[in-house]
Interface confidence: medium
């Protein structure tokens, strides 16, 4: 028996289902008495769902997940995993016995899209030209971890001085904050990127400070 | 008929590690699930996990995740439990049982397994 | 876990007599494939544990009829009519619905 998936990792939002495909080809008068199917965690070997016996075996891993019984039969072994967490990111093998077995593996990546910047300077009041001011670019509920970029408002990369920190919440989702230390000019704009690696989303924020008061762009 | 052989008795110093062995026999191993149940003198059975001989795949009771490791040779239809970091709250009779996933008909006459200095 | 709650903790019988025990899970043991996975084991003294009852009501081959088992959802029962003097040591029942896989406490049946 040869057990095919996709050799493209599978990419899931969290709290979305993701299907892991697998697939086998039965040979003529194949019955689903004969099936052994398995799939588990690749690393750990933790068991996820079975078939075996002629029957479903359920889920082992938090009653999250489902094989697709109807079409068992005609080879397909994928498994539906629901309500995509964070933690379930990693390697799973589809291991399909017959008379003699096959086994492959799958990668499902996870993501979340993070939220629009809020962006915050201090101080942010009796701003004068040449001030040191800070501003501070805030991001939420992303996953995996954000790439971050500040620009001026000539699109100049500004790369000196800026520290992002990174923390992960009980969910392992990232609130991103990334601040930029700068000497204020005459008036200038300093735009913040956020940018997901993952579904190449990107989020924007921005503010403009023009002598007084500051302003902030309206939202997109 | 099914059997599932296992040493009668273990004696290990705390700290230790050891790794107790079920011989199955009288049936094909790879078509058995087979899982770990440990009793304690006096006391109800606790399982512990299974694993499935052709995959290797395994299912742990989180009581036991740190605490044992399911393993199985199948050129010797062999499965076997490694506990480590033993204590005195390890010594137990360890039994192994062959069936589903979801049931378990045959059992070993299990280890006795004795944790003291 | 689902926590399996057996009583009596001691069931003192005379040989001939009826036994009744008692299995009450913490939550349904209907399985999402619709089985329900409550087996009834006899323990006797030195010895593994013994198959008597699987899926709450099927006897396991060998097994005498004067065994039956009853139930459903959280609430089971083992009987055993004219009890002889092999059917004494510790029943446990078990489900194996929910990982983790859990026992009850176990029921002595003993001469009274």
């Known amino acids: 028996v040869e057990v095919q998936v996709s050799e493209d990792p599978v990419v899931a939002l969290v709290d979305t289902d993701a299907t892991l495909r697998c697939s086998f080809s039965p040979e003529p008068g194949f019955s689903l008495a004969q099936l052994n199917l398995i799939w588990q965690l690749t690393d750990t070997k933790q068991l996820v769902h079975s078939f075996t016996e002629g029957r479903d075996q359920g889920s082992a891993y938090s009653n999250r997940t489902a094989l697709f019984p109807d079409l068992l039969v005609q080879g397909n072994a994928s498994l539906r995993l629901q309500r995509v967490r964070v933690t379930d990111e990693g390697s799973y093998t589809c291991f399909v016995s017959i008379q003699d077995f096959d086994s492959a593996a799958v990668s499902l990546q996870v993501a979340a899209p993070y939220s629009k910047p809020s962006m915050t300077l201090e101080p942010n009041k009796d701003l004068r030209p040449g001030n040191m001011v800070t501003i501070t670019c805030s991001s939420y509920q992303g996953y995996p971890e954000a790439e971050v970029f500040w620009k001026d408002g000539q699109g100049v990369p500004l790369t000196g001085n800026v520290t992002t920190s990174q923390m992960a919440n009980e969910r392992g989702l990232f609130d991103v904050h990334s601040v930029l230390r700068v000497v204020l000019g005459a008036n200038g704009t300093y735009s913040c990127l956020v940018r997901n690696p993952v579904l190449q989303q990107d989020a924007h924020g921005s503010v403009t400070i023009t002598g007084q008061p500051l302003t902030f762009p309206p939202e997109a | 008929q099914v059997q599932l052989q296992q040493p009668g008795a273990e004696l290990v110093k705390p700290g230790a590690s050891v790794k107790l062995s079920c011989k199955a026999s009288g049936y094909t191993f790879s078509s058995y699930w087979m899982h770990w149940v440990k009793q304690r003198p006096g006391q109800g059975l606790e399982w512990i996990g299974l694993i499935h001989p052709d995959s290797g795949s395994t299912n742990y009771n989180e009581m036991f995740k740190n605490k044992a490791t399911l393993t199985v040779d199948r050129s010797s239809s062999t499965a076997y439990v490694q506990l480590s970091s033993l204590t005195s709250e390890d010594s137990a009779v360890y039994f192994c049982?062959?069936?589903?996933?979801?049931?378990?008909?045959?059992w070993g006459q299990g280890t006795t397994l004795t944790v003291s200095s | 876990d689902v926590v399996m709650t057996q009583t009596p903790l001691s069931l003192p019988v005379s040989l001939g007599d009826q036994a009744s025990i008692s299995c009450r899970s913490s939550?349904?043991?209907?399985?999402?494939?619709?089985?329900?996975?409550l087996r009834w084991y006899l323990q006797k003294p030195g010895q593994s544990p013994k198959l008597l009852i699987y899926?709450?009501?099927n006897r396991f081959s060998g097994v005498p009829d004067r065994f039956s088992g009853s139930g459903s959802g959280t609430d089971f029962t083992l009987k055993i009519t004219r009890v002889e003097a092999e059917d004494l040591g510790v029943y446990f029942c078990s489900q194996s619905t929910h990982v983790p896989y859990t026992f009850g406490g176990g029921t002595k049946l003993e001469i009274k």
């Open positions: 899926k709450v009501s």
């Open positions: 939550q349904s043991l209907v399985h999402s494939n619709g089985d329900t996975y």
């Open positions: 049982a062959g069936g589903g996933r979801l049931y378990f008909d045959y």
